[in-house]
């Protein structure tokens, strides 16, 4: 029961996490204009992995895609790659984990196969979560570096007569979504791995025990047994997990120049 709950919860947590990673990857607000010096702005800039946007006081919002691959910073490309790898691994992990769920019957799939699939999906979720966290963290680090660089030369101009305020960018909502989503996927993966340990039957070798009854001697050599299903020899010599009492249904069978942070 605990195994099923752990596996199910791991699946749900991972599902939420992967949905969050997808959402974060698609979001435009990876970096947003820093409003510390000017909290009331008529033009608000924000940028995502795929496009940059400008929202005006008038309510008009214009977004422009990054229509170049070669012109983009290597770090941005790396972040994109990490997020995509995270999504792909997560999606495959979800697919595998669906078939690995104890509550779903697929033909006569053995517990050992389910255990292996659970472990595989768990590892995939862990890697997926790590990819997302790494991607978001690389982007955040890039933002912090650029923030302090632009703060150092906040105002540039001719002899200080004309001021050109450099737009500084800070953490956008997508970063927080990405961190949380990555964390959830990671936790979900760990839960799946824990559930796998419960699913995987341990090889139990029972030593022959001699019972000396009065009159005649009978030696019992029992095979493995399934609790609540009666004793019987393990004729197929397959691993059977003694998981305590189980109910019947629990038995498994526009190109333009942009600021890139």
């Amino acid at each position: 029961m605990a195994v099923t709950a752990c596996q199910g919860l791991g699946f749900v947590v991972s599902l939420i996490g992967i949905a969050g990673i997808i959402a974060a990857t698609c979001m435009d607000q990876w970096s947003t204009q820093d409003l510390y010096n000017n909290p009331v702005t008529a033009v608000f800039n924000y940028q995502g992995l795929w496009r940059s946007c400008v929202r005006e006081s008038s309510g008009f919002t214009e977004c422009r895609g990054y229509f170049t691959l070669l012109g983009l910073p290597a770090m941005l490309q790396a972040v994109r790659a990490l997020m995509i790898v995270g999504i792909v691994l997560g999606a495959i992990g979800l697919l595998v984990s669906i078939f690995a769920l104890k509550c779903i019957r697929i033909g006569s799939m053995e517990d050992s196969a389910k255990a292996n699939m659970t472990l595989t999906s768990g590892i995939m979720f862990i890697v997926s979560g790590l990819c997302a966290i790494a991607g978001v963290s690389v982007f955040a680090n890039m933002l912090v570096t650029n923030f302090w660089m632009s703060t150092a030369n906040m105002y540039t101009g001719m002899g200080g007569m004309v001021q050109t305020v450099q737009t500084r960018y800070t953490f956008g909502a997508a970063l927080f979504v990405g961190w949380v989503a990555g964390g959830l996927t990671l936790i979900g993966g760990v839960m799946m791995c824990i559930a796998c340990r419960g699913l995987a039957p341990e090889e139990t070798n029972y030593k022959a025990v001699s019972y000396h009854a009065s009159g005649h001697s009978v030696a019992y050599k029992p095979g493995g047994f399934k609790a609540s299903t009666g004793f019987g020899s393990n004729t197929k010599n397959k691993k059977i997990y003694d998981g305590g009492a189980r109910t019947e249904d629990e038995v498994q069978s526009y190109p333009s120049k942009h600021d890139y942070v």
């Epitope: 204009q33 033009v43 400008v54 005006e56 006081s57 309510g59 942009h258």
Partner: antibody
Amino acid sequence: DVKLVESGGGLVKPGGSLKLSCAASGFTFSSYTMSWVRQTPEKRLYWVATISSGVSYTYYPDSVKGRFTISRDNAKNTLYLQMSSLKSEDTAMYYCTRLTKGNAMDYWGQGTSVTVSS
Amino acid sequence: DIVMTQSPSSLTVTAGEKVTMSCKSSQSLLNSGNQKNYLTWYQQKPGQPPKLLIYWASTRESGVPDRFTGSGSGTGFTLTISSVQAEDLAVYYCQNDYSYPFTFGAGTKLELK
């Protein structure tokens, strides 16, 4: 056809109050950011207030902050400017405007005159 | 606050002449996010409210004759009328739309010789 009609102007004593109204028609009023702009007798233009569409964020220059309040009633398609603690320098023609791309004011009303004098 | 300075304050021209007026801002009006300059030009004829001519420094409002051209970037902007017509006699204002408070220039008055 877009139409903005201001009303509520008049003569008021210093320290007094006045509420200007702007009736909008010919466009989806609730979807647009609206502003008030005034023109002094010397023909200088000054931005007075802005109210965004949707959640209705408001913006004011320091010269009117705390004295003027911009508001809107989307059900009535009307923009308001509540003016209090009026000063002689508030004497001007007040225009109701609609904001468009580039934060530009694409439509202006005919204006309503406000005179602050004792 | 961004200070908008227009020059000259008045211009006397003859019909058909090419006219250029300047507008300078104390801070750059160029937004790095979309590479657009948040400067607007308005025309005001006597007894009328101002009328939008050009936004984003060079984008002509629909219905505005193509003899009106806006140019410039950063802090220096220009409004050019390629061939002045009698109906163009008015006061022209430039406005900062980049940051609050929105500020206007004092205007350039276009008069007929």
